[in-house]
């Protein structure tokens, strides 16, 4: 080994070196939280970049760059260090137009803490292992969601566009002429029935067990879907999103009530099956796999 390499190895294995890097990262994180940093922080930024560069140089000199089994770039944790340094120099010396977008990569510096703290490194390692093990469960989840999304698509396509429309139109008005002239929220409220405090027109349906319109209103299929058009089963992708919402139980009762009002109470069976399978079974299966992965990592 050359004297330079010997010195680099000594520095690398020294506990003070790890301590210095850890303190640098934490101080850097504190500086990054500043809203309006003063001008002198620019020099501090250069110091941090210098320390990170020094750390990487020490590692490269001690272990080699990329040829060989235990070299710098063969360790995935060092990829992060390398990216951090590259972006630090890029944002500083190269004019790339939208620098603010590149500046967001400075946040990656905070992730360097993981590679420095051994316990954290183990946990993240376990997390990555669990993600690998999750692939099969994820495939099953996506498959189940896709199947139910297709069923939802067939059962409820267009149903959430059913609205209670005012019967007493002016003599020259028609549904089409009104829809062409509607602009504001007030215009909509003039012709469609809204429950007090509701931001969407009252949903209705054409089956006997679906929601009925109040007197003076008739059920029509027109306009957009509820929640600014985001809640629907009109395409596979929207149906998939709705099913994902059911699986994660994200305000699912609202989707359930909307659909049952538009399609009919019979369709509660669909929701019972989806909640039991998707929300109770699949979510717990995912948790079980993650727990197993952590257990294996600990052993």
């Amino acid at each position: 080994f050359s004297p330079l390499r010997r010195i680099s190895i000594k520095i690398l294995v020294h506990s003070l070196f790890s301590m210095l890097i850890m303190c640098t990262i934490l101080t850097n994180c504190i500086f990054m939280t500043m809203n309006n940093p003063p001008d002198w922080t620019k020099n501090v930024e250069y110091t941090f970049t210098g320390i990170y560069t020094f750390e990487s140089l020490v590692k490269i000199l001690a272990r080699g760059f990329c040829v060989g089994e235990f070299t710098f770039l063969r360790d995935p944790w060092n990829w992060l260090d390398f990216v951090v340094i590259v972006f630090a120099y890029l944002t500083e010396f190269v004019n790339l137009g939208n620098v603010s977008a590149l500046r967001t990569f400075r946040v990656l510096r905070a992730l360097k803490t993981i590679s420095v703290i051994p316990g954290l490194k183990t946990i993240v390692g376990a997390l990555i292992q669990s993600v690998k093990k999750l692939s099969d469960v994820m495939i099953l989840t996506v498959f189940c969601l896709s199947v139910f999304a297709l069923i939802g698509l067939q059962l409820f396509m267009g149903n959430l566009k059913h609205k209670c429309f005012r019967n007493s139109l002016e003599n020259n008005e028609t549904l089409e002429s009104i829809m062409n002239t509607l602009e504001s929220e007030e215009d909509f409220r003039k012709y469609f029935y809204y429950l007090e405090g509701s931001k969407d027109a009252l949903l209705c349906g054409f089956s006997t067990d679906s929601g009925q319109c109040p007197e003076g209103y008739t059920c029509v299929k027109i306009g957009r879907n509820p929640d600014y058009g985001y809640t629907s089963f009109d395409t596979f992708s929207w149906a998939f999103l709705a099913l994902f919402r059911l699986m994660t139980q994200d305000y699912w009762e609202n989707l359930y009530q909307q659909t049952l009002r538009a399609a009919g109470k019979t369709y509660m069976i669909f929701f019972v099956v989806v909640i039991f399978l998707g929300s109770f079974y699949l979510i717990n299966l995912i948790l079980a796999v993650v727990a197993m992965a952590y257990e294996e990592q600990n052993q």
Epitope: N167, G216, T218
Partner: nanobody, 124 residues
Framework: EVQLVESGGGVVQPGGSLRLSCDAS????????MRWHRQAAGKQREFVAR???????DYADSVKGRFTISRDNAKNTVYLQMNSLRPEDTALYYC??????????????????WGQGTLVTVSS
């Protein structure tokens, strides 16, 4: 496809009566309001009467007390009973309805549908 067909028109003497009917056919799920309009030769089309799906009615001032609109929801039909007819009632009578129906591919569509019209002539 939804179709509206008017019938019952014809020639009648002043003071006489006629009953017009309008039949809606197709894969109809719901009919909202149904309206009768008329258009005399060289004139603008004018509203005559309306009936909603909960049977609320409304009439043009010129026919109030003489014409009666009714509907049969089971048959998807609207009727216009015209009594005490006058020469100025001579016109082509159209039926209009707000219909929600199941169209090609099983999707649902709501829209305004019109009939071809039936001619009513009041003359001595």
């Amino acid at each position: 496809e939804v179709q509206l067909v008017e019938s019952g028109g014809g020639v009648v003497q002043p003071g006489g009566s006629l009953r017009l009917s309008c039949d809606a056919s197709g894969r109809i799920l719901r009919i909202g309001y149904m309206r009768w309009h008329r258009q005399a030769a060289g004139k603008q089309r004018e509203f005559v009467a309306r009936i909603t799906d909960d049977s609320a009615t409304d009439y043009a001032d010129s026919v109030k007390g003489r014409f009666t609109i009714s509907r049969d929801n089971a048959k998807n039909t609207v009727y216009l009973q015209m009594n005490s007819l006058r020469p100025e009632d001579t016109a082509l009578y159209y039926c209009e309805a707000l219909v929600t129906a199941s169209v090609r591919g099983g999707s649902i569509h709501s829209g305004t549908y019109w009939g071809q019209g039936t001619l009513v002539t009041v003359s001595s």
